[in-house]
């Protein structure tokens, strides 16, 4: 790598990837095994994240990128960058503090993580229950008596599923 | 960042209470149980129990009832170990850790540790 | 409540040399769930706790591959391939299955 020959800050030709390694007059030197720089300029490179235990690693880290981590089966990401692998549950149930907990009646969660949702409430747009919810599955929605003609929109589809705001322990 | 800070050493005198305070940042404590860890001098570890600061719902190690008490604020983003009648027994360091089976983060997190000396 | 029972008290090992810490529990971890929460903690010398490995054989982030945790039932194991002189401290196996928590009476690692 070339000796940097800027009159402000020498270290600043140093490319993403390498640092600027003060023991050797401020050469260029690259990022060694494990570690990274993703800017220009940098007077040390960062040790690559470690995807281990219930992390994965999604993306290998590079020269001048971090490595990215997901979560095993069974369980899924929370938190920004994936800080946090959190324990799936089956349909129809939460985690809750002490664990997987059933949906209570009334509610239901069609996926492994989230929340219990309560059913639509099909009176509210005038609607009747045309088949009724469970803990995996909200109710669908049909028409009322008074829209039973011909050409009626006869289901309404379910709210889409939110995230939790918080993860339980 | 994720970090429990926990208040600073106390010298009480026998008889007296303390109260411990864990204030986390970088996470809300009320999605977590508390967990409240003793360390008496060259000891090993010692379970004294949990919170869960969303409801104030306690569960204690049976020869801490009445020893402990754990409360939390959740404004605050604090966790509080009270400890009455002291006696020597008491010496210790007591760690707050929000240890879950069901999330598990990227670094495990243990409180700073405050150190208790019961002596007249 | 479920104790945990550690062996051995203290172990001397040269650098570079393996070591092994065995952790026996006076009831099965396995939850009903199908999940074993043991973990092993090192608490270094006037340090906080550090946890090393959960669900008995998960290692955490920035711990070294030469730890290895294994086991199930009652019986778990802690290894190390190779130990370092960073490796010191107290290690203590926990379990999270039952109520109360209970922790191993702890396992002093010295370097010879």
């Known amino acids: 790598f070339e000796r940097t020959r800027s009159l402000q800050d020498p270290c600043s030709n140093c490319p993403a990837g390498t640092f600027c390694d003060n023991n050797r007059n401020q050469i260029c030197s690259p990022c060694p095994p494990n570690s990274f720089s993703s800017a220009g300029g940098q007077r040390t490179c960062d040790i690559c994240r470690q995807c281990k235990g219930v992390f994965r690693t999604r993306k290998e880290c590079s020269s001048t990128s971090n490595a990215e981590c997901d979560c095993t089966p069974g369980f899924h990401c929370l938190g920004a960058g994936c800080s946090m692998c959190e324990q799936d549950c089956k349909q129809g149930q939460e985690l809750t503090k002490k664990g997987c907990k059933d949906c209570c009646f009334g509610t239901f969660n069609d996926q492994k993580r989230g929340i219990c949702r309560p059913w639509t409430n099909c009176s509210l747009d005038g609607k009747s229950v045309l088949v009724n919810g469970t803990k995996e599955r909200d109710v669908v929605c049909g028409p009322s008596p008074a829209d039973l003609s011909p050409g009626a929109s006869s289901v309404t589809p379910p709210a889409p599923a939110r995230e939790p705001g918080h993860s339980p322990q | 960042e994720v970090q429990l800070q926990q208040s600073g050493a106390e010298l009480v005198r026998p008889g007296a209470s303390v109260k411990l305070s864990c204030t986390a940042s970088g996470f809300n404590i009320k999605d977590y149980y508390m967990h409240w860890v003793k360390q008496r001098p060259e000891q090993g570890l010692e379970w004294i129990g949990r919170?869960?600061?969303?409801?104030?719902?306690?569960e204690y190690v049976p020869k801490f009832q009445g020893k402990a008490t754990m409360t939390a604020d959740t404004s605050s983003n604090t966790a509080y170990l009270q400890l009455s009648s002291l006696t020597s027994e008491d010496t210790a360091v007591y760690y707050c850790?929000?240890?879950?089976?069901?999330?598990?983060?990227?670094?495990?997190?243990w409180g700073t540790g405050t150190t208790v000396t019961v002596s007249s | 409540d479920v104790v945990m029972t550690q062996t051995p008290l203290t172990l001397s090992v040269t650098i570079g040399q393996p070591a092994s810490i065995s952790c026996k529990s006076s009831q099965s971890l396995l939850d009903s769930d199908g999940k074993t929460y043991l973990n092993w903690l090192l608490q270094r010398p006037g340090q906080s706790p550090k946890r090393l490995i959960y669900?008995?054989?998960k290692l955490d982030s920035g711990v070294p591959d030469r730890f290895t945790g294994s086991g199930s039932g009652t019986d778990f194991t802690l290894k190390i391939s190779r130990v370092e002189a960073e490796d010191l401290g107290v290690y203590y196996c926990?379990?999270?299955?039952?109520?109360?928590?209970?922790f191993g009476g702890g396992t002093k690692l010295e370097i010879k």
């Open positions: 850790t929000p240890y879950s089976n069901y999330v598990y983060w990227y670094f495990d997190v």
């Open positions: 919170i869960d600061p969303e409801d104030g719902d306690t």
């Open positions: 926990w379990q999270g299955t039952h109520f109360p928590h209970t």
């Open positions: 669900l008995v054989s």
